[in-house]
Each structure stands twice: as C-alpha cells, then as structure tokens.
C-alpha cells in the first residue's frame, strides 16, 4: 500500500508535513515522525533550545541560542544576580541583595569600617583607631596634634 503525500505507517494513519511556523519547526523522517529542526525541541518542536549554559532557572528563550534573563538576573547565561541599586562594595546571592565585602557596612555597603586601613589618615607616626563606619581617631605622638596629627 502506498500512502498519499504526508501520510505514513501501516494503514497510512499517521500524518506529518514539515512546517516552520508558530505551530512547530520540524521535518519528517521516513516513518512520519517529527524530527525537530536544529535549535528546537519538544513534542511539536516548538520549544527553542537556549544558549548552551543558559540558566534553566533564571534564563529562557523563544529563539534558539538566545538566553533572556528573568527580572533580577543578568549575564550571558542569566546566572548572575543583580544587586540592590546603589550597592557599592557588596555582592548578591539573590536579586536585590547587598551583602557587604569585608570592612564595608551600611545598607549599600558604602560605609568604610576600616577607614584607617583604607585611607591611613594619621600623619607623623600617629596611631589610627576605627571608631565607626567612616570614622576614625588618631593618637598623635608627642609634639603633634590635630585630627590627623598634622600640626
């Protein structure tokens, strides 16, 4: 029995006609099974295969090879969270966090907790002590005075 065009199988009860549109992107094998075009997958070959490495959790695509990030995620593979806007010396594990690096504090990690180490403000051999975020105190050697032992 020879089947009509696009019909396959015993009894010619399987239909497959190649298509490349909203409904699917496929060719047909000799048995009438849909064979997805490169970059497509799923039962109807209408699901795009995203860029290799694209985060399955935070990235997606509607076109093969693409990787579109969910809100709050960024990077080529959508695997990097976006920190809180204005976060200076901080990182995130989840979107909009601002987890401060060592020696930084405050909501935006913009307060220096180690002003002495970062700026070394005390002159003329003065000893620096961190007294709070962005705050310090110099203990001046004999003969020197002023906030930074500059006098």
């Amino acid at each position: 029995v020879t089947c009509d065009d696009y019909y396959y199988g015993f009894g010619c009860n399987k239909f497959c006609r190649p298509r490349d549109d909203f409904f699917g992107h496929y060719a047909c094998d000799q048995n009438g099974n849909k064979t997805c075009m490169e970059g497509w997958m799923g039962p109807e070959c209408n699901r795009a295969i995203c860029r290799q490495g694209c985060s399955p959790k935070h990235g997606s695509c509607k076109l093969p090879g693409d990787c579109r990030c969910q809100y709050g995620w960024q990077g080529l593979y959508c695997d990097k969270c976006i920190p809180h806007p204005g976060c200076v010396h901080g990182i995130c594990n989840e979107p909009w966090q601002c987890l401060c690096e060592t020696n930084w504090g405050g909501q935006l990690c913009d307060k220096d907790l180690n002003y002495c180490g970062t700026h070394q403000p005390c002159l003329n051999g003065g000893t620096c002590s961190n007294t709070g975020p962005d705050k310090y105190q110099c203990s001046c050697p004999e003969g020197y005075s002023g906030p930074n032992c500059e006098i």
Epitope: Y7, F15, R17, D21, F23, G42, R47
Partner: antibody, heavy 116, light 107 residues
C-alpha cells in the same frame, strides 16, 4: 486521563469583563497549546484564539483582537480567557480545547450571559 | 483568512443510509482538516483529523477523504446515535476557522 475543567456560568452586564478558567490535568500542561472556541445559542462554533502554554504567547482571531486576553498559570496548569467590553452578542458557551491536530479534548463549556 | 464552506447546512436521512458531507476551503490547506460531531448541550467530539485519520474510539463507519481544498466526511451506514451536527475545521494557519455546520436529522 486528560481532563479540562472550566469555571462556572457567569452573568455579566454590557461593558463588563469576564474571565473564564480552564484547569488541565492528566498530561504535561506545557506540552500542548490551549485554544478557546465559543458557540452562541443555536449558532455554530467560532475559534477565538490559541495560547502556547510553554511561553504564554497567544494569537487571536481578528474579530476579538483588542478585547480578548489569553493567559496561563503553569503552576496550577490553568488557562484563562478574559473578554472585555462585553455586549449582548457575546452571550455564548465558551470552550477551552487542547491540541495541534484538531481538538481531541474539550472543557465542558462555560455559559456567559450578557444582559442588562 | 481561510473561508470554510460546508454543505449541506442540513440533511434528512434514515438509519442505514450512506451520508456525505463536504467542506470546501478558499485556499489549499493540504490535509490540515478536522471533522467534529456535536450533540445538543455537549462539547464537540473529534471524529477525523488530518482529513482522513479516524480519532481513537470512533466507529469505522465514519471516514474522511480529500486534500487541498475539497474534503468529505462519509458515514457509510447511519446509526440512530449519529443524528447530530457536524463541523469541519482547518488547522493550517491562524485563524483556525470552522465550517458553518451540517445538521443531520432523522427523515
């Protein structure tokens, strides 16, 4: 087994909106598109549109463009059809249906009555 | 949009009769055609898809044929439960329009 269960009958005033739900079970929801079809009393079947349940992309019949919105909630395997600016001619049974090569599965239908 | 012309719009026949319903499309739709049966107050039931493939559980007295623009649904020997309304629908491109329906009544 595959089932599509729709929300109950609605009575709406002209100008209002209606949102009909269609809860799917018995298969992987995102593997198949959902279509919406309506049937006015004593009339034939009218195709309204299709939604790709994986991406949420939808395509509508020109007649309903601008008035219909089809959405899905994949977490509950539910499709929704919202029709706005209702008029008396929108009184119909609204069906959801599943498929690519024709509709093997249909919801039981939701009667929407538009009356002042 | 593809127009679907279904004929006849109504038909009277007797049990045991052979019945043919036709559907013509305004452009080539290959074999992207479906036939449904609908009874009052019920959702349509899929009978034939891709023009000639019988849906699961549908009796073999139903058959579909045609491709391109001309399609036929045939019931070889009418049974009492076959009296209903029949619709064709294309699924070639958007929108998936339906034919106007054929009401099959008992003579």
């Amino acid at each position: 087994q595959v089932q599509l269960v729709q929300s109950g009958a609605e009575v709406k005033k002209p100008g209002a909106s209606v949102k009909v739900s269609c809860k799917a079970s018995g298969y992987t929801f995102t593997d198949y598109a959902i279509h919406w079809v309506r049937q006015a009393p004593g009339q034939g079947l009218e195709w309204m549109g299709i939604i790709n349940t994986y991406y949420g992309d939808s395509k509508y019949a020109q007649k309903f463009q601008g008035r219909v919105t089809m959405t899905v909630d994949t977490s509950t395997s539910t499709a929704y059809m919202e029709l706005s600016s209702l008029r008396s001619e929108d009184t119909a049974v609204y069906y959801c249906a599943r498929g690519y090569d024709g509709f093997a599965y249909w919801g039981q239908g939701t009667l929407v009555t538009v009356s002042s | 949009d593809i127009q679907m012309t279904q004929s006849p719009s109504s038909l009277s026949a007797s049990v045991g009769d052979r019945v043919t319903i036709t559907c013509r499309t305004s452009e080539n739709i290959y074999s992207y055609l479906t036939w449904y049966q609908q009874k009052p107050g019920k959702a349509p039931k899929l009978l034939v898809y891709n023009a000639k493939i019988l849906a699961a559980g549908v009796p073999s007295r139903f058959s579909g044929s045609g491709s391109g623009t001309d399609f036929t649904l045939t019931i070889s020997s009418l049974q009492p439960e076959d009296f209903a309304t029949y619709y064709c629908q294309h699924h070639y491109d958007i929108p998936w329009t339906f034919g106007g329906g054929t009401k099959l009544e008992i003579k």
